[in-house]
Amino acid sequence: VSITKCSSDMNGYCLHGQCIYLVDMSQNYCRCEVGYTGVRCEHFFL
């Protein structure tokens, strides 16, 4: 699987995490920081 950084256009897409471009799947994916969940890492959980 080819992985690269998301384009600068996606700055701010992942609220609490890192945006990863899964090239082969044509998808942006948010890798959430510890304590966050959701498609865009928008939810905090304890």
Epitope: T4, D9, L15, S26
Partner: antibody
């Protein structure tokens, strides 16, 4: 499955405004960005702008800045494009497209023809 | 704003011919370039993204290459169903389409 259903064709007078809707199904628009693209007769595709429905932040092409407003209603999973001060040059097919989780536009609405005529 | 200059604006080729379209960006777009096929009355169809990655279900006769500011799209053997207008799209910083290339059969 992912679907984007746009509102029907419109005929408007010069100087008027038009509002086109794009109802999403199969996904939550808060997980994405929603973009608008248009194509005038015998012209190319033009990106107009986008909205982040999670926070209502918008970005517009400078060509349309001040005349275009993109909004989203997350309760109905719908994005809107409003274009004001219409002229005959705004006669075009207007498309919504999903961004965000899709780096490029894979999913498009069916297009809405807006005709501006006196 | 990033500008995309696409050429030629139109071309005519025979079935089986190799067709090549170029797109030049006004600044480095880091391979964030896609190619679309657009037929009248239809929504545009994604063919290639990230310069050279074929979208699932797209025939292998379509290909893309390039980096930085200069990009190329090719159809290795033109088929009748390939008659359409083709657009490049940069998605590094917001979005900009090239002017389009109308492909016709001789």
């Amino acid at each position: 499955q992912v679907q984007l259903q746009q509102s029907g064709a419109e005929v408007k007078k010069p100087g008027a405004s038009v509002k086109v809707s794009c109802k999403a199904s199969g996904f939550n628009i808060k997980d994405t960005y929603m973009h608008w693209v248009r194509q005038a007769p015998e012209q190319g595709l033009e990106w107009m702008g986008r909205i982040d429905p999670l926070n209502d932040k918008t970005k517009y092409d400078p060509k349309f800045q001040g005349r275009v407003t993109i909004t989203a209603d997350t309760s109905t999973n719908t994005a809107y494009l409003e274009l004001s001060s219409l002229t005959s040059e705004d006669t075009a097919v207007y498309y919504c497209a999903r961004g965000g989780g899709d780096p490029v536009f894979v999913y498009w609405g069916q297009g809405t023809l807006v005709t501006v005529s006196a | 704003d990033i500008q995309m200059t696409q050429s030629p604006s139109s071309l005519s080729a025979s079935v089986g011919d190799r067709v090549t379209i170029t797109c030049k960006a006004s600044q480095d777009i880091n391979k964030y370039l896609a190619w679309y096929q657009h037929k009248p009355g239809q929504a545009p169809r994604l063919l290639i993204h990230y310069t050279s990655t074929l979208h699932p279900g797209i025939p292998s006769r379509f290909s893309g290459s390039g980096s930085g500011t200069d990009f190329t799209f090719s159809i290795s053997s033109l088929q009748p169903e390939d008659i359409a207008t083709y657009y490049c799209l940069q998605y590094d910083n917001l979005r900009t389409f090239g002017g389009g290339t109308k492909v016709e059969i001789k």
